[in-house]
């Protein structure tokens, strides 16, 4: 039975040109995490973190996506086009797949959004799908 819960950084905002940390955490399960996929709203994969093989950052994002911290992902040089949903998909054994959602709003530099390491955020919990 799948008992786990994913906690994410929820709805976050950051300034254009700045950076933001996307972070998910899987709890309440003893399942082994074999892989975490980071995905964008339009079916794009940003990165994969395989537990044994390490990080693969997708070619289109190599110049402005940095792995970590931990299983998280850092988006740099933010543009207005980065606004939207992001998903962390945890592949686990034996539970299966867990998915978390983060919504990022990129604000004009003159706006009041957070800069640097993550901007403003609210924690969200997601149960398994």
């Amino acid at each position: 039975m799948m008992t786990g819960t994913i906690e994410t950084t929820g709805n976050i905002s950051a300034k254009k040109g700045g950076s933001v940390i996307l972070q998910c955490h899987l709890s309440s399960t003893m399942a082994q995490v074999t892989q975490v996929n980071w995905e964008q709203h339009d079916h794009s994969l940003l990165a994969i973190r395989n537990a044994e093989l390490g990080w693969h950052i997708y070619p289109a994002f190599k110049d402005r996506v940095a792995p970590g911290p931990g299983l998280g992902l850092t988006l740099q040089s933010l543009t207005m086009n980065d606004t939207g949903e992001y998903f962390c998909t945890y592949h686990t054994y034996p539970d299966g797949t867990y998915r978390g959602r983060i919504f990022l709003e990129v604000l004009e530099s003159s706006g009041g959004g957070g800069a640097g390491g993550g901007g403003h955020h609210h924690h969200h919990h997601h149960h398994h799908h």
Epitope: T34, S44, L45, N50, E52, L53, G54, H56, Y58, H91
Partner: antibody, heavy 121, light 107 residues
Framework: QVQLQESGPGLVKPSGTLSLTCAVS?????????WHWVRQPPGKGLEWIGY???????NYNPSLKSRVTISVDKSKNQFSLKLSSVTAADTAVYYC??????????????WGQGTLVTVSS | EIVMTQSPATLSVSPGERATLSCKAS??????VAWYQQKPGQAPRLLIY???YRYTGIPARFSGSGSGTEFTLTISSLQSEDFAVYYC?????????FGGGTKVEIK
């Protein structure tokens, strides 16, 4: 230039153990990457068997996991496949391959030429 | 297990013509797809990774596209050396799987 070369018996008896080695030249297999075995039954598609990571950890196809062992011989710069309790369904060309996960994800960029293993009495 | 289904099984094309090969995944694999070429008696050769990126040294006539569950390998103008079997592979999940292959033959 990285090169991989499979070797081992071309004929194995049913219920026996298939043993193959992959000799790697041009790169030290304990320095990086993951090292894989893939097989192809005659006239059919490709099936991933498993890998050994340069760190020594292994991962196997769940459908074969109970019968497969992949190991590394550092001194000879080679890695090996053992598949136990073989049947005629294990008759295939067996390939070894390298995966550069950081650059190409789960795609395998260097392959050996393959060796045909027939399971028959 | 994610099943990759390729079509058609055989594609007959004249040299110089365009070839379009299809690969469908049984579930969403985003863009975690690679394509390989295999000639008789030879090992597979990596052509495309991440659905649309050409591997080092692969001619520009080979291109990949698609995301989610539907992927396409296009050979814009077939050369004699391109007649071979082509396989797709997914690596979205931790159990990598291949399609059954499409044989591109001379018409």
């Amino acid at each position: 230039q990285v090169q991989l070369q499979e070797s081992g018996p071309g004929l194995v008896k049913p219920s026996g153990t298939l043993s193959l080695t992959c000799a790697v030249s041009g790169y030290s297999i304990t320095s990086g990457y993951s090292w894989h075995w893939v097989r192809q039954p005659p006239g059919k598609g490709l099936e991933w068997i498993g890998y050994v990571h340069y760190s020594g950890s292994t991962n196997y196809n769940p459908s074969l996991k109970s019968r497969v062992t992949i190991s590394v011989d550092k001194s000879k710069n080679q890695f090996s496949l053992k598949l136990s309790s073989v049947t005629a369904a294990d008759t295939a060309v067996y390939y070894c391959a390298r995966m550069d996960y950081g650059n190409y994800g789960g795609a395998m960029d260097y392959w050996g030429q393959g060796t045909l293993v027939t399971v028959s009495s | 297990e994610i099943v990759m289904t390729q079509s058609p099984a055989t594609l007959s094309v004249s040299p110089g013509e365009r070839a379009t090969l299809s690969c469908k995944a049984s579930q969403d694999v985003r863009t975690a797809v690679a394509w390989y070429q295999q000639k008789p008696g030879q090992a597979p050769r990596l052509l495309i990774y991440s659905a649309s990126y050409r591997y080092t040294g692969i001619p520009a006539r080979f291109s990949g596209s698609g995301s989610g569950t539907e992927f396409t390998l296009t050979i814009s103008s077939l050369q004699s050396e391109d007649f071979a079997v082509y396989y797709c592979q997914q690596y979205y999940s931790t159990q990598w799987t291949f399609g059954g292959g499409t044989k591109v033959e001379i018409k």
